[in-house]
Interface confidence: low
């Protein structure tokens, strides 16, 4: 791991973060019925899942642990400059490296700082540069980077040959692994002909390891099991039902646009976040149950949002897969009840990606400055930026670009509790609609 | 001693192609960014393109990017500028330059721009119909 | 992009003057500027990078300074080979972008 600046921040993690408010119930749209011991095993199972991944995502992000930003000019401490820094020709003052465009990872006597790498055509940037920490780059899914030719990603073979059965997916950094069925060996060669091909479908989730899969998969079955007869036996029950079942067997109509004031505000996040107490001691995103991916290949088989829903609903299985549209609850100017959501917006962002997401988001360094300069005090910095943001692009400043730009900085779990308090704060509500829609 | 050398300039009609060559000695070519520089008549200076010292890297001004094309040849020593669809403001005299930060092999660092410290006598390009 | 505004444009000086040029940038470029003269029908010499670093074999007389958005190119006392264009360049970010030149005449 890198070495931090003396006066680095800790990692993101322990951030404040907004306690359960008013959300409106979502419920699935009309399916079959379900049993109701199935039911509750299911969303556990979904809740389990959703903790695993937020726990996952919260480790992924852990290295923010980037330097505290410090002033254009220092003084070198020993003939040395801090991280993110690089010392001036005169050997006298330390000058801060460029975001996103070089960096230093430690106490240097450099007269410059080391250009960040940028990540090829066929890769993802996992993480961006800062001033220090250079880029991090990955291949794109369906490609590899093998050991002996790490200069280019390589497509992963689509299916196993004739007679051999797979064994391990195609990840970032192997192709998929084949093995005859009877002898069990490895096979190495080029895959033959399409037609002779056992294809592999290309939405399965990278695993490394098949049967470390199976063993949690199975554990986390055993542990389903029991806290499902806990919370059975728990004075809980009554309380989850009736929102289990809404959840799992809605009554018909849009769930979308449930009439929230029949509602008692937060009943159902407190019923939520018992359960959630009870599943898994350590934060959780209060998102529905749908299942964020993690960043980074786990070996646990988890469920994809779209394969948590068909596991809910069967007759509706050959559906494409949906985006979920965030829509202002009361029909309401998007960018301006996006505007009054800003104010909360600094605990739900590690300090450390504020500055990267209002350039993802189209801010220049001196607007980045200036507002950094005329907000009221720390806290309140975030707000300026994203106030000169829709100034800036006015009706193109959507909650979907911030969101994007979230996931695009690698910050899940910020966008997950971003998304969730626009939910909550009964300001935005989920509107469905087709992945491709272009709505603000 | 060290020199650039451009040449390919000439007169092209709105709309074709022209390639620009750089030629550069008297240092280790391979471990400096490149870069091309223009200047229209009467005008001030234009940064154009800069292409890194293993061609791993290329970026481009507004005004010419999708249209031009910066690239390196270590093993030839030469830079190049490969310019299509012209237009009547490309017409210029068109500089190659050296970037004054220099790639070492024996640590990872490469620098960024700290200015152009060896320039060519410049080839001249003249757009017109 | 980041403009960069020269000024003035041009400017009549005698033997032995103190000349200042400036350069401002559109937003903060920190200390990532660089100053350059061009005398007619050559090309153009790097002077100072980085604000304030001398090139190898540029006179004494010639000095930098600045930060930010607001820098000063400053000729302590102007000499007859001093005559010529100058040039401030931004490298704090692509597309490397120059000021519009100013153009040190004899008065």
């Known amino acids: 791991m890198e070495q931090r600046g003396q006066n680095a921040p800790a990692a993101s993690g322990a951030r404040k973060r907004h306690g359960p408010g008013p959300r409106e119930a979502r419920g699935a749209r009309p399916g079959p019925r379900v049993p109701k011991t199935l039911v509750l095993v299911v969303a556990a199972v979904l809740l389990l899942v959703s903790a695993e991944s937020a726990l996952i995502t919260q480790q992924d992000l852990a290295p923010q642990q980037r330097a505290a930003p410090q002033q254009k000019r220092s003084s070198p401490s020993e003939g040395l400059c801090p991280p993110g820094h690089h010392i001036s020709e005169d050997g006298r003052d330390c000058i801060s490296c460029k975001y996103g465009q070089d960096y230093s990872t430690h106490w240097n006597d450099l007269l410059f700082c080391l250009r960040c790498t940028r990540c090829d055509s066929g890769e993802v940037e996992l993480s961006p540069c800062t001033t220090t920490r250079n880029t991090v780059c990955q291949c794109e899914e369906g490609t590899f980077r093998e050991e002996d030719s790490p200069e280019m990603c390589r497509k992963c073979r689509t299916g196993c040959p004739r007679g051999m059965v797979k064994v391990g997916d195609c990840t970032p950094w192997s192709d998929i692994e084949c093995v005859h069925k009877e002898s069990g060996t490895k096979h190495s060669g080029e895959v033959p002909a399409v037609e002779e091909t056992v294809t592999s479908s290309p939405g399965t989730p990278a695993s490394p390891c098949s049967l470390s899969g199976i063993i949690i998969g199975v554990t986390v079955a055993a542990v389903v099991l029991i806290v499902a007869v806990f919370v059975c036996k728990s004075l809980l029950w009554k309380k989850v039902l009736p929102y289990l079942k809404g959840i799992c067997s809605g009554g018909g109509g849009d769930p979308e646009r449930v009439d929230r004031s029949s509602q008692r505000p937060g009943a159902e996040d407190n019923v939520l976040n018992e359960i959630v107490s009870i599943l898994q001691p350590t934060q959780v995103p209060e998102q529905e149950m749908e299942v964020q991916e993690p960043a980074e290949p786990t070996g646990v088989n988890m469920l994809s949002p779209g394969e948590s829903e068909h596991l809910l609903e069967p007759a509706e299985a050959e559906r494409s897969q949906r985006r979920r549209l965030l829509v202002p609850a009361n029909e309401g100017d998007p960018t301006e009840t996006l505007r009054q959501c800003f104010d909360d917006f600094a605990d739900l962002v590690p300090f450390d990606s504020w500055e990267p997401l209002m350039r993802k988001l189209g801010l220049m360094d001196n607007e980045i400055k200036v507002a950094k300069a005329e907000a009221a005090g720390h806290r309140d910095t975030l707000y300026t930026m994203l106030i000169k943001w829709v100034n800036k692009t006015g009706r193109d400043a959507s909650v979907h670009t911030l969101l994007d730009a979230l996931e695009t900085l690698g910050e899940r779990l910020a966008k997950q509790k971003i998304e969730d308090h626009l939910l909550s704060s009964g300001k935005f509500m989920y509107l469905e609609g087709n992945a491709d829609s272009a709505m603000s | 001693q060290v020199q650039l050398v451009e040449s390919g300039g000439g007169v092209v009609q709105p709309g074709r192609s022209l390639r620009l060559s750089c030629a550069a000695s008297g240092f280790t070519f391979s471990t400096y960014g490149m870069h091309w520089v223009r200047q229209a008549p009467g005008k001030g200076l234009e940064w154009v393109a800069v292409?890194?010292?293993?061609?791993?890297?290329?970026y481009y001004a507004d005004s010419v990017k999708g249209r031009f094309t910066i690239s390196r040849d270590n093993s030839k020593n030469t830079l190049y500028l490969q310019m299509n669809s012209l237009r009547a403001e490309d017409t210029a005299v068109y500089y190659c330059a050296r970037d004054r930060t220099v790639y070492s092999s024996s640590s990872p660092f490469y620098y960024y721009y700290y200015g152009m410290d060896v320039w060519g006598q410049g080839t001249t390009v003249t757009v017109s119909s | 992009d980041i403009q960069m505004t020269q000024s003035p444009s041009s400017l009549s000086a005698s033997v032995g003057d103190r000349v200042t040029i400036t350069c401002r940038a559109s937003q903060s470029i920190s200390s990532y500027l660089n100053w350059y003269q061009q005398k007619p029908g050559k090309a153009p010499k790097l002077l100072i990078s980085a604000t304030s670093s001398f090139q190898s074999g540029v006179p004494s007389r010639f000095s930098g300074s600045g930060s930010g958005t607001d820098f000063t190119l400053t000729i302590s006392s102007l000499q007859p080979e001093d005559f010529a264009a100058y040039y401030c360049q931004q490298s704090y970010s692509t597309p490397l972008t120059f000021g519009g030149g100013t153009k040190v005449e004899i008065k």
């Open positions: 292409i890194w010292y293993d061609g791993s890297n290329k």
